[in-house]
């Protein structure tokens, strides 16, 4: 297996982006949701994959300079999937006072489809991304972001909503997936694991990353989220993986340094506006895209997911702060807030670049690449 290289010669203050070398493509897991070595079973047996909640989105950002190194998804190491059962998404939360567990949570009852029938849909998120099987679509152009560099005032609301940390974004952050596919950013949020346990929602070749940021957007064709839920393309999420690097990420530090203030679930604080694009990778031209769902109830489908090929680097201390500061409902730590990967059920993940091309020699037999469907339509 090839291991990712650490970021080299990052600019002062540390850039957001990870390295650029491609992920290995060996040892493909045989199932979308088979358990990974990085995700040891939780303290309790978990029901099927639909029961495992997944979070929504985080702040969006616009392209940065190409000076930073970056780790690319197609370069990530792969991990052989052990043969144990479904990968758990259990955050080991325990509700106080013997709660009846009748609200949704990560791991355990109630099964999510009982909370929202859409969670049993066929086209759910997150998914495992296998670059070799992605369809290269030249029509997928670089993402366009406008208005993501926010001034310090007005301040933004940072909230511990009990299942993630959420930054509410002001009006005016515009994003285009392509011509006529225009969106406005609503909020961003994060998903993470626990000490020694990664917590990204999406995986690549079975590899789970330490954390993942989601920036959630609403199509300009709709006035409100509830009008867009379940409508194809009504919502779009930009997702990026967060990895450990040698330097502190100054952009993320503006948020992470305030988590202590919102440790209690339901609490919130105000933070100065910041460059939201600095929270995302710098390369807006290389990404994977597919149609899926919200990763928490109501699990509404029709969501366009764009997963950056480049990762974002945070220091070990920052990743620890993210996973070890917040509390969720019932006096439980807010950790492992990711949903299990869901089956593709025939969906083809598209790539804006030839992700399936492996430049290194390999003895394995060639893989049939999927063809690009209707990218850009």
């Amino acid at each position: 297996q090839r291991l990712p290289r650490m970021q080299e010669d990052s600019p002062l203050g540390g850039g957001s982006s990870g390295e650029d070398d491609p992920l290995g493509e060996e040892d493909l897991p045989s199932e979308e949701d088979s358990p990974r070595e990085e995700d040891p079973p939780g303290e309790e047996d978990l029901p099927g994959e639909e029961d495992l909640p997944g979070e929504e989105d985080l702040p969006e950002v616009k392209p940065k300079s190409e000076e930073e190194g970056s780790l690319k998804l197609e370069d990530l190491p792969t991990v052989e999937a052990p043969g144990d059962p479904q990968e758990p998404q259990n955050n080991a939360h325990r509700d106080k006072e013997g709660d009846d567990q009748s609200h949704w949570r990560y791991g355990g009852d109630p099964p999510w489809p009982r909370v929202s029938p859409a969670c049993a849909g066929r086209f759910q998120s997150p998914v495992d991304i296998r670059p070799q099987l992605a369809a290269f679509c030249p029509a997928l152009r670089p993402l366009e972001l406008l208005g993501f560099q926010l001034p310090p005032l007005p301040e933004l609301r940072l909230r511990n909503n009990g299942h993630s940390v959420q930054l509410t974004l002001p009006p005016g952050l515009e994003m285009a997936l392509g011509p006529g596919r225009e969106y406005r950013a609503l909020q961003l949020h994060l998903h993470w694991g626990a000490a020694g346990r990664p917590g990204s929602e999406h995986t690549v070749e079975g590899h789970r990353f330490p954390a993942e940021i989601h920036v959630v957007h609403l199509s300009t064709a709709f006035a409100r989220v509830d009008e867009a839920l379940g409508r194809p393309g009504g919502l779009a999420v930009l997702a990026a993986f967060l990895e450990e690097g040698p330097e502190e990420n100054s952009a993320y530090e503006q948020l992470l340094s305030r988590l202590e203030e919102i440790a209690e679930e339901g609490s919130e604080t105000q933070v100065p506006g910041l460059d939201i694009s600095a929270l995302l990778p710098s390369d807006f031209s290389r990404y994977f895209q597919y149609e899926g769902s919200l990763t928490t109830p109501p699990c509404a489908q029709g969501v366009i997911w764009t997963v950056f090929n480049q990762t974002v680097m945070l220091s070990a201390k920052q990743l620890h702060t993210l996973s070890d500061t917040l509390w969720g409902p019932g006096d439980s730590r807010l950790q492992l807030n990711f949903r299990a990967t869901q089956p593709l059920n025939g969906r083809v993940i598209e790539a804006s670049f030839p992700a399936g091309v492996d430049s290194s020699p390999r003895a394995a037999e060639p893989v049939q690449l999927n063809s690009c469907l209707a990218a850009g339509d």
Epitope: W104, S116, P154, R157, Q166, P171, R224, P297, G328
Partner: antibody
Framework: QVQLQESGPGLVKPSETLSLTCTVS????????WSWIRQPAGKGLEWIGR???????NYNPSLKSRVTMSVDTSKNQFSLKLSSVTAADTAVYYC??????????????WGQGTTVTVSS | EIVLTQSPGTLSLSPGERATLSCWAS???????LAWYQQKPGQAPRLLIY???SRATGIPDRFSGSGSGTDFPLTISRLEPEDFAVYYC?????????FGGGTKVEIK
């Protein structure tokens, strides 16, 4: 069309616990915040607190020590408990839908309200 | 917490007239997350305006909200008989959520 219906005892004795339930019909309870608001006779509106369908709560600091909210997604219901009540807690109690976690837009659906009197 | 002050306490007008209600916040309201509600006797409040200026579903266009920061007026361009009621502003940008004391619009 989403509708809300409050239910619970109309009379509660001082020092006891007021318990109300709001039943959501005509739509899903998931992904929304759900609030409780009260209004003493002839007075204005006071927000008590809210709950998300993950069980996360946020209470008005003035009532926090006495309030507990819970949600039962399988029954499409959420509940309010207010302990150690006094005559000052006599009011009409409303439940309301309070936006989504993806987007805030105020309380767009309200129950018709239930009158709770605290008296021995 | 953010304190919302509404004025006037009572507004006496005739049908067909224009009504302007004011709501002032003690500090800037996050993202202009301010709503207006109408309440008639014996009824629950009804959402009129959210985000300071967006009309809720089914609300006639004679109701319009505006303003930003700390000053948020509500205008009813031409009063209809059914518009006589109490109007509350509410901020939902920061916790705790707070309501103004209300303005009663009565028939002159």
């Amino acid at each position: 069309q989403v509708q809300l219906q409050e239910s619970g005892p109309g009379l509660v004795k001082p020092s006891e616990t007021l318990s109300l339930t709001c039943t959501v019909s005509g739509g899903s309870i998931s992904s929304y915040y759900w609030s409780w608001i009260r209004q003493p006779a002839g007075k204005g509106l006071e927000w008590i607190g809210r709950i998300y369908t993950s069980g996360s709560t946020n209470y008005n600091p003035s009532l926090k020590s006495r309030v507990t909210m819970s949600v039962d997604t399988s029954k499409n219901q959420f509940s309010l408990k207010l302990s150690s009540v006094t005559a000052a807690d006599t009011a009409v109690y409303y439940c309301a839908r309070d936006g989504q976690w993806l987007e805030d837009y105020g309380m767009d659906v309200w129950g018709q309200g239930t009158t709770v009197t605290v008296s021995s | 917490e953010i304190v919302l002050t509404q004025s006037p306490g009572t507004l006496s007008l005739s049908p067909g007239e224009r009504a302007t209600l004011s709501c002032w916040a003690s500090q800037s309201v996050f993202s202009n997350y301010l709503a207006w509600y109408q309440q008639k006797p014996g009824q629950a409040p009804r959402l009129l305006i959210y985000g300071a200026s967006s009309r809720a579903t089914g609300i006639p266009d004679r109701f319009s909200g505006s303003g930003s920061g700390t000053d948020f007026p509500l205008t009813i361009s031409r009063l209809e008989p059914e518009d006589f009621a109490v109007y509350y502003c509410q901020q939902y940008g920061s916790s705790p959520l707070t309501f103004g004391g209300g303005t009663k619009v009565e028939i002159k």
